[in-house]
C-alpha cells in the first residue's frame, strides 16, 4: 500500500498550477490586440477570425465583407491593401522575410467592381515594396531595386529609376543600415497627400565594406551572404532624395532635393521625410556626428518647376550634452496652416517635451513641461493635440494618452486614459481615424491587454474591440508570479526596477536572483506591461526572483540619465546593474551565492561585462547574440553614442570597452555564450572573438551556436534556446530538474 497525502479540495491554491516552459514555448498565454485599419473618419477594415476582410462603419453600426476568405485563399494571401478609391485591393502572398522590416512578396490586384483579378500588365515578382497612392488607385512599387509607377492597376508600368542594383544602388527601399538604424521601415518612398508627387530616396552602397557570412543550408557547399554593412568608422551609404511628378512623370523627370549647406559640408544622413501639402515637403537631415539635425521645409515653385528649400525654412536642432533626439530624431507634426509644426525635443531642463515651432526653433513655444517626458504625438487636429507621456503618478514606465485643446487659450490638458481602467491599464497606445473623429486605445497592461473604440470628440468608449476573454479564463488556474515596480535612489540617480516574485514569495526566505538586462541607449525595460514569458515561468515554477533595472542611458527620465553614457558605452550601464544587485541583496531575500545575469543583443554585451566586472557578485550568466566590440557594430547606431573609432576622436574607449579585453575576468564565473551564425545584425564575429579571447586566456566557458539563424533565433531554435538556458540556470542555481 502506497500512502499519498490527500488532496485538499477546498484550497484554491491546490487547484492552481505553476507555469511550465511548454506553456511559454507554445505561446499558450499570448494576447491579442485590435488595431483598426482606418479608411475614413468613421470606417475601418479588419480581418476577421475566418479571414474575411470586413468593413465596419461606426456611425451606422453596419459591417459588410468587402473581400471573402475564398478570394484571399485563392492566391494564399496573408495581407491586403484597399485602394483609397475603394475600387481595388492588392493581395500579398509568398511572404519572404529579408531583414527586420523588409520582405519580398507576390502581389495580385483584385478589382472589386467586377469581382475579378486584374489581368494584363500583371505585377512582376517578387516585389520589394508596393503601395497605393493616398488618393485614387495609382500604384508605386519597387522591383529589383528600381521604382515603378502605374497610373491604374491594369496599366503598363512606368519605370522611374534605372540604376538599381542588388547590394549597390537601392531606390525606394533602404539598404541594411538605413532600414535597421535610421528609417525603421522597409520603404524609402513617400506619396504627397493627394498623390501628385512621389518622393524617394536613393542609397548608393558602392563603396561600403561588405560583411560576408556562410549560410549552410542543405547543399554540398554553403552559400555566402554578402551585405553592404558599414561598421563604426567605415564608409557610409550616400543618400539622395528625389521627387517626381506622377501625373506626367515622363516629362520633367526626377528632381533632386537639395541638401542644406551646413549638412552637405561633411558626411551626413537623411533621417525622414514628411509631406505637408502636395506642394510642400519637409526633410530631416543629420550630420554623421549625430548631434546636429536640420529640418528643411521645401516648396514646389510651379513657375520654375523646382523644389526650393530656403535657408529661412531650415530649423536646426543641436545637442550639447549628447546626441540629437532620443533613439531617433523626432519627426514634426504639422498644423493646419501647413507651415508651423509640433515636435518633441529637449527643453532647457533636459526633458523631452512638445514644442510648437512657428518661425524659428529659438522662438519655439513649449507646450508640455515637467520632470517627465512627452513620448509620441499621435495626431493634431484643428482644436486638439493628442500625445502620450509618462507623467501620471511619476512612473516613467507608464504611457497614458493626453489631449491638449489647442483651439482655446490657454490650452487645457486632459488625460484621456489615466482613470479608465486604472489597475488594469497603465500603458497605452492609440490609433486615430481621419480628423481624429474616432480612435482606438490599445492597453498593454499591466493587466490583461484590452482594445477599445472611442469617440474623438467626447472620448466616450463606444465598444470593446478585443478584451482577451479566452486568455483571462485560461489564466484562472495559473499561479502567476507577483510583479512590482519600484525605485532605488543611489548617488542622485534614480534606478527604477521591476521585480518578478514567485507566487508564494516569502520575504523571510532566500531566493536565487536572475537579472534580465538590455540597457541600450534610449531603451526602457521597466514598463507597466502584461507578459507571460520565460522569466514568468522561472519565477512561477522554478522559484527564482527576476529583476529588470533601468540604469543610466535608458529613456524617458530626462537627458541627464539618457546622455550619461554618451561616448562611454559599457561603463555606467554595467555599474548600475551591479549597484542594483547590491541593493537587492540588502533587501534580505536574495541568496547572494545564487545570482545570475542574462541579456540579448545589447543586453548580452552588458551581461558579459557585468560577469567580467570582477565583483564576485555573479555566479553565472548568459549572453545571447552579444556585441563584443563597438568596432564590429553598425556605424549609424554606434557612432550616435560613441563618436568615431579614430585616434583624434574616441578610439581609446572603443578599445577599452570590449568584452575581449576582460577575458581573464571570466575565470570565476560560469558563462554561456550563444549566437546565430547567420546574424545579419550583430554578426557572429562578435561571439567568435569572445570565444577566441577566452580560449587564448585558457578560460573555460559554455557555448551554443544556432546554424543559419539570425539575431532573433526564431522557430525551433527558440524552443531549443530557452530549454538550454533553463538547464544552464537550474544547474547554476542547484535546482533539481
Amino acid at each position: 500500500i502506497v500512502l499519498r497525502p490527500s488532496r485538499v479540495h477546498n484550497s484554491e491554491e491546490n487547484t492552481m498550477r505553476a507555469l511550465t516552459l511548454k506553456d511559454i514555448l507554445n505561446g499558450t498565454f499570448s494576447y491579442k490586440t485590435f488595431f483598426p485599419n482606418w479608411i475614413s473618419g468613421q470606417e475601418y477594415l479588419h480581418q476577421s477570425a475566418d479571414n474575411n476582410i470586413v468593413l465596419y462603419n461606426i456611425e451606422t453600426g453596419q459591417s459588410y465583407t468587402i473581400l471573402s476568405n475564398r478570394t484571399m485563399k485563392s492566391v494564399n494571401a496573408s495581407n491586403y491593401g484597399l485602394s483609397p478609391d475603394r475600387q481595388f485591393v492588392y493581395l500579398e502572398s509568398d511572404y519572404s522575410k529579408l531583414w527586420r522590416y523588409s520582405y519580398t512578396a507576390t502581389y495580385y490586384i483584385y478589382d472589386l467592381s467586377n469581382g475579378e483579378f486584374v489581368r494584363g500588365n500583371e505585377l512582376p515578382r517578387p516585389i520589394q515594396y508596393l503601395c497605393w497612392s493616398p488618393v485614387g488607385s495609382k500604384l508605386a512599387y519597387v522591383y529589383q531595386n528600381n521604382i515603378y509607377l502605374k497610373q491604374r492597376p491594369g496599366d503598363p508600368p512606368f519605370q522611374i529609376t534605372f540604376n538599381g542594383r542588388e547590394n549597390k544602388i537601392f531606390n525606394g527601399i533602404p539598404d541594411w543600415v538605413y532600414e535597421e538604424e535610421m528609417l525603421a521601415t522597409k520603404y524609402a518612398l513617400w506619396w504627397s497627400p493627394n498623390g501628385k508627387f512621389l518622393a524617394y530616396a536613393e542609397f548608393n552602397d558602392t563603396d561600403i565594406p561588405v560583411i560576408a557570412y556562410s549560410y549552410y543550408g542543405d547543399e554540398q557547399y554553403p552559400r555566402t551572404i554578402n551585405i553592404p554593412y558599414p561598421k563604426a568608422g567605415a564608409k557610409n551609404p550616400v543618400v539622395r532624395i528625389f521627387i517626381i511628378d506622377t501625373t506626367y512623370p515622363a516629362y520633367v523627370g526626377p528632381q533632386e532635393v537639395p541638401v542644406p549647406a551646413m549638412i552637405a559640408s561633411s558626411d551626413y544622413y537623411f533621417s525622414w521625410l514628411t509631406w505637408v501639402t502636395d506642394e510642400r515637403v519637409c526633410l530631416q537631415w543629420l550630420k554623421r556626428v549625430q548631434n546636429v539635425s536640420v529640418l528643411s521645409i521645401c516648396d514646389f515653385r510651379e513657375d520654375w518647376q523646382t523644389w526650393d528649400c530656403p535657408k529661412t525654412q531650415e530649423h536646426i536642432e543641436e545637442s550639447r550634452t549628447g546626441w540629437a533626439g532620443g533613439f531617433f530624431v523626432s519627426t514634426p507634426v504639422f498644423s493646419y496652416d501647413a507651415i508651423s509644426y509640433y515636435k518633441i525635443f529637449s527643453d532647457k531642463d533636459g526633458y523631452k517635451h512638445i514644442h510648437y515651432i512657428k518661425d524659428t526653433v529659438e522662438n519655439a513655444i513649449q507646450i508640455t513641461s515637467g520632470k517627465w517626458e512627452a513620448i509620441n504625438i499621435f495626431r493634431v487636429t484643428q482644436d486638439s493635440l493628442f500625445y502620450s507621456s509618462n507623467e501620471f503618478e511619476e512612473y516613467p514606465g507608464r504611457r497614458n494618452i493626453y489631449r491638449i485643446s489647442i483651439g482655446s487659450y490657454p490650452p487645457s490638458k486632459k488625460c484621456v486614459t489615466c482613470h479608465l481602467r486604472k489597475e488594469r491599464c497603465q500603458y497605452y497606445t492609440a490609433s486615430f481615424s481621419d480628423y481624429a473623429k474616432y480612435y482606438a486605445l490599445v492597453c498593454y497592461g499591466p493587466g490583461i491587454p484590452i482594445s477599445t473604440l472611442h469617440d474623438g470628440r467626447t472620448d466616450q468608449e463606444i465598444k470593446i474591440l478585443e478584451e482577451n476573454k479566452e486568455l483571462e479564463n485560461a489564466l484562472k488556474n495559473i499561479q502567476l508570479p507577483k510583479e512590482e515596480i519600484k525605485k532605488l535612489e543611489v548617488d542622485e540617480i534614480t534606478l527604477w526596477y521591476k521585480m518578478i516574485l514567485p507566487p508564494q514569495f516569502d520575504r523571510s526566505k532566500k531566493y536565487p536572483l536572475l537579472i534580465q538586462v538590455y540597457g541600450g541607449p534610449c531603451s526602457q525595460s521597466v514598463r507597466s506591461v502584461f507578459a507571460v514569458n520565460w522569466i514568468s515561468y522561472l519565477a512561477s515554477k522554478e522559484g527564482m526572483v527576476i529583476a529588470l533595472v533601468d540604469g543610466r542611458g535608458t529613456a524617458f527620465q530626462g537627458d541627464k540619465l539618457l546622455y550619461a553614457v554618451y561616448r562611454k558605452l559599457g561603463v555606467y550601464e554595467v555599474e548600475d546593474q551591479i549597484t542594483a544587485v547590491r541593493k537587492f541583496i540588502e533587501m534580505g531575500f536574495i541568496d547572494e551565492k545564487r545570482i545570475a545575469i542574462w541579456g540579448w543583443s545589447y543586453g548580452g554585451y552588458v551581461s558579459s561585462l557585468a560577469l567580467a566586472s570582477g565583483t564576485g557578485l555573479f555566479k553565472c550568466g548568459i549572453a545571447v547574440a552579444p556585441v563584443s566590440s563597438w568596432e564590429y557594430y553598425a556605424s549609424v547606431y554606434t557612432e550616435r553614442f560613441m563618436g568615431l573609432p579614430t585616434k583624434d576622436d574616441n578610439l581609446e574607449h572603443y578599445k577599452n570597452s570590449t568584452v575581449m579585453a576582460r577575458a581573464e575576468y571570466f575565470r570565476n564565473v560560469d558563462y554561456l555564450l550563444i549566437h546565430g551564425t547567420a546574424d545579419d545584425n550583430v554578426h557572429f564575429q562578435n561571439s567568435a572573438q569572445i570565444a577566441k579571447a577566452l580560449v587564448n586566456a585558457q578560460v573555460d566557458f559554455q557555448a551554443m551556436w544556432y546554424s543559419d539563424q539570425n539575431h532573433g533565433l526564431s522557430g525551433l531554435s527558440t524552443n531549443h534556446l530557452y530549454t538550454h538556458m533553463t538547464h544552464f540556470l537550474k544547474q547554476c542555481f542547484s535546482l533539481s530538474d
Epitope: Y248, A250, G253, Q305
Partner: antibody
Framework: EVQLLESGGGLVQPGGSLRLSCAAS????????MSWVRQAPGKGLEWVSA????????YYADSVKGRFTISRDNSKNTLYLQMNSLRAEDTAVYYC??????????WGQGTLVTVSS | EIVLTQSPGTLSLSPGERATLSCRAS???????LAWYQQKPGQAPRLLIN???RRATGIPDRFSGSGSGTDFTLTISRLEPEDFAVYYC?????????FGQGTKVEIK
Amino acid sequence: EVQLLESGGGLVQPGGSLRLSCAASGFTFSSYAMSWVRQAPGKGLEWVSAIIGSGASTYYADSVKGRFTISRDNSKNTLYLQMNSLRAEDTAVYYCAKGWFGGFNYWGQGTLVTVSS
Amino acid sequence: EIVLTQSPGTLSLSPGERATLSCRASQSVTSSYLAWYQQKPGQAPRLLINVGSRRATGIPDRFSGSGSGTDFTLTISRLEPEDFAVYYCQQGIMLPPTFGQGTKVEIK
C-alpha cells in the same frame, strides 16, 4: 522665352570624337531633365540620351551606350554630348530637347554631325 | 523596346478636310505617355499633343489626341495650309523612348 541653341557639329572621321553643346535660356535649366534626339538625313527621329535636372542620372540608347556621354553644367545653363568612336551611322542632325522621356516641348534648331572619311 | 507603327505613311488631303492619323504600339502605352509632334522641312519638331492627350501651349484646338492602350489617334478637324507636314507619335513609358516612323500629310 525658352531658347535652346546647339553647337559643335561638323565633319569628323570614323572613330573620331566631337562634343556638342546646347545653351539654354528662358527657364530654370537645373529643374528640367534634358535630352538629345537625332535625325538621320531623310529619316525619322531617334532618341539618343537624357539627363535629369541635377545631373545625377543619365540614360542612353543602346546604339550609343559606351560611346556617348551626356552631361550638364547647371551654373552655365549648358547641356553637352560627348561623342566618341563615331561611326557613319551616327551622321544626323542632333537636337537638344527639353524633357526626359517624352513631352519634348522645346527643341533647338539642331546641329549637323557628319561622320565620313 | 516599344515599336510605334504609324499609318498611313502618307495622307493626301485638301485644306478644310479632316485628317485622322493612327499610331499603334507594339505593347500597351496609355495616353499618359504618348505625345505627337509636327515637323516641317528644315525645322525642328514641335510638340502638338503632350503626354496625357493635352494640347501643348499655343496649339490650336483643331488638333486633338485620343486613344488608350495600344491604339492612338491624332485628329486635325479642319486642315489649314500650315498643317501640311510630317507628324510623329512618341512613347515615353519605356526606355528607350521611341518615335513612330512618321505620317506625311500632303496637299492633295
